[in-house]
């Protein structure tokens, strides 16, 4: 009891615990495969602690390993959608600074219309996180069919 | 190791480590889409610390952000199978109190027979969290192809 | 502040924090359905913090609940080259010591190129995981394809 | 057969209030997030407001900002809009329109019903 | 907020015409685009979603296309039941934001 306490008096983000959980916002202009994504509570359930959005991008503000994961399902899909929009894939990179720019997860639609992943994966502060959606079909901007989120684990 | 110690005097429920992972007990009579679980340490490798189960369904005893994580194998299934008896959709939700209801995660099978996936949500205390399988195929019961968790990450 | 500093001086292991990313590094032998892992800050994103590779399958250091996880995309594949080599499948689970052997994950390709899911588990040191994948087809050994790694999340 | 039905308009004096309803069948409600689209007369399509599911995301369009509360009750299969401070530009035929189940379209609509502001 | 034009604001045309209508948003909307039709007294019907998408129930002769700014409403014969008001919207980002209409008249 007296450690949970002493825990209460500390702010949270000395204990490291940057999370972030987004949702859809919308796909980029022509010819930018970005997904954009938006975040906070006047939005549902999506949330930044620590983490920061930049023009739809995740910003991350601690050093750290972090799990990332993505679920993305597409809009007015079927099997037969799928494979004849193939290919239609998924990346989830760092994007800046461009030193540091590398692919973490990358997925293929084939013939389904939902991909899910996740993956632990060093990260450091002012790293930016680019979610990549190319092909021709849309992202539902249902929120509980496409989200991505990161969750710090450790130094 | 002086801290290591003192950690260990402490009970694990005042650090918030509430986890639970389940395994498929049985699916529900007709017109009852939820799937029921079970789990605890004599029913193989599944647990619970903190949540409780509530006939079968999932409670929540600590407020936070989660990691709800499941995968869901359908029994006697191929790609032929499953694009015949499409859709078939799973869906996490709150399902009670009522005022909180809401779909958290939602995944069709297409042309497969398993989907898995996971995602961060804020839960609070009495939270039920139940997962519904729509559709006319049955889930495997096999521990290694079905199971839904969940792991407190922060407050 | 001061926390974030006693914590500095802390051994990070004495609060449990075990987590490892692994990128494959080739398939086993004919008769030998085993993936080999290869991972550290050497061959790019991956990372051994705590477990450890034995003959490239993944050795536990710690007893604990973990979070397991593994994405693996099959090389040179589409959704009729999955079909055409069903059965394709990936199981991850404890293979030694003997005494503990249990599969603790397993998803099959059918029409679909990739496969990705998580679940929690009770590891206990000395437990090596292996992930068989049965079947015609081969990997990629792409770093955003294929991979797998284990997170400690709590005793 | 899907069906969404208005109800509640009719005249009011500026500054007034209203309250109105729309009555779902045919579908799960609660699958759909609902939007509120307006057309004054001779005028054109304006979008006015936008609910969710689990009403934990709500839009507004400027114009009615403020003024106007959306609100459903997923158990009667019901939407509301709650108008007040009412003005002459108000005036309207006002439709509730189901979302499409995977993007922001409106693939059904309700028949209308007509919202007159004067005094 | 995203301004639509539509051109143009109205056309006279005769059965068995092909009409097309254009759509222009004041900065890309990737496919996030809506068509409807309005007839005198009624409520909007969907036609086109996702750009290019027929909406279910809604005859081959109507199609949708274009990406980011420009879009097109092709009607490729013209029918007695299609002379109504047609609608883009965006659903790009909120506000969504409709066209100002274009009306489809017997010549």
């Known amino acids: 009891q007296r450690f949970a306490q002493a825990q209460q008096q500390l702010p949270l983000e000395s204990l490291g615990w940057d999370v972030a959980e987004l949702q859809l916002n919308h796909t980029g202009p022509q010819q930018d495969p970005r997904l954009y994504w938006q975040g906070g509570p006047a939005l549902g359930r999506s949330f930044l602690h620590g983490p920061e959005l930049d023009k739809g991008q995740l910003r991350i503000h601690r050093d750290g390993i972090y799990m990332v994961h993505i679920q993305v399902t597409l809009a007015i899909c079927s099997s037969t959608t799928a494979s004849r929009h193939h290919p239609t894939t998924l990346a989830v990179g760092i994007c800046s600074p461009a030193s540091r720019s590398i692919s973490l997860l990358r997925l293929s639609f084939h013939q389904g219309c939902t991909i899910a992943s996740q993956r632990l994966t060093p990260l450091a502060r002012g790293d930016t996180l680019c979610t990549n959606l190319t092909g021709t079909l849309l992202p539902s901007r249902n929120t509980d069919e496409t989200f991505f989120g990161v969750q710090w684990v450790r130094p | 190791q002086r801290f290591a110690q003192a950690q260990q005097q402490l009970p694990l429920e005042s650090l918030g480590w509430d986890v639970a992972e389940l395994q498929l007990n049985h699916t529900g009579p007709q017109q009852d889409p939820r799937l029921y679980w079970q789990g605890g340490p004599a029913l193989g490798r599944s647990f619970l610390h903190g949540p409780e189960l509530d006939k079968g369904q999932l409670r929540i005893h600590r407020d936070g952000i989660y990691m709800v994580h499941i995968q869901v194998t359908l029994a006697i299934c191929s790609s032929t199978t499953a694009s015949r008896h499409h859709p078939t959709t799973l869906a996490v939700g709150i399902c009670s109190p009522a005022s909180r209801s809401i779909s958290l995660l939602r995944l069709s099978f297409h042309q497969g027979c398993t989907i898995a996936s996971q995602r961060l949500t804020p839960l609070a205390r009495g939270d039920t969290l139940c997962t519904n399988l729509t559709g006319t195929l049955l889930p495997s019961r096999n521990t290694d192809e079905t199971f839904f968790g969940v792991q407190w990450v922060r407050p | 502040q001061r926390f974030a500093q006693a914590q500095q001086q802390l051994p990070l292991e004495s609060l449990g924090w075990d987590v490892a990313e692994l990128q494959l590094n080739h398939t086993g032998p004919q008769q030998d359905p085993r993936l080999y892992w290869q991972g550290g800050p050497a061959l790019g994103r991956s990372f051994l913090h705590g477990p450890e590779l034995d003959k490239g399958q993944l050795r536990i250091h710690r007893d604990g609940i973990y979070m397991v996880h593994i994405q693996v995309t099959l090389a040179i594949c589409s959704s009729t080259t999955a079909s055409r080599h069903h059965p394709t499948t990936l199981a991850v689970g404890i293979c030694s010591p003997a005494s503990r052997s249990i599969s603790l994950l397993r998803l099959s390709f059918h029409q679909g190129c990739t496969i990705a899911s998580q679940r929690l588990t009770p590891l206990a040191r000395g437990d090596t995981l292996c992930t068989n994948l049965t079947g015609t087809l081969l990997p990629s050994r792409n770093t955003d394809e294929t991979f797998f790694g284990v997170q400690w999340v709590r005793p | 057969e899907v069906q969404l039905v208005e109800s509640g308009g009719g005249l009011v004096q500026p500054g007034g209030s209203l309250r109105l309803s729309c009555a779902v069948s045919g579908f799960t409600f609660s699958n759909h997030n609902i939007h509120w689209v307006r057309q004054a007369p001779g005028k054109g399509l304006e979008w006015i407001s936008y609910i969710s599911r689990s009403s934990s995301t709500i839009y507004y369009a400027d114009s009615v900002k403020g003024r106007f509360t959306i609100s459903r009750d997923n158990a009667k299969n019901s939407l509301y809009l709650q108008m007040n401070s009412l003005r002459d530009e108000d005036t309207a035929v006002y439709y509730c329109?189901?979302?499409?189940?995977?993007?922001?379209?409106?693939?059904?609509w309700g028949q209308g019903t007509t919202v007159t502001v004067s005094s | 907020d995203i301004q639509m034009t539509q051109s143009p604001s109205s056309v006279s045309a005769s059965v068995g015409d092909r009409v097309t209508i254009t759509c222009r948003a004041s900065q890309g909307i990737s496919s996030w685009l809506a068509w409807y039709q309005q007839k005198p007294g009624k409520a909007p019907k969907v036609l086109i979603y996702?750009?290019?998408s027929l909406q279910s129930g809604v005859p081959s002769r109507f199609s949708g296309s274009g990406s980011g700014t420009d879009f097109t409403l092709t009607i490729s014969s013209l029918q007695p039941e299609d002379f109504a008001t047609y609608y883009c919207q965006q659903a790009f980002s909120f506000p969504f934001t409709f066209g100002p209409g274009t009306k489809v008249d017997i010549k």
């Open positions: 996702a750009a290019s």
């Open positions: 329109a189901r979302d499409h189940a995977q993007w922001y379209g409106m693939d059904v």
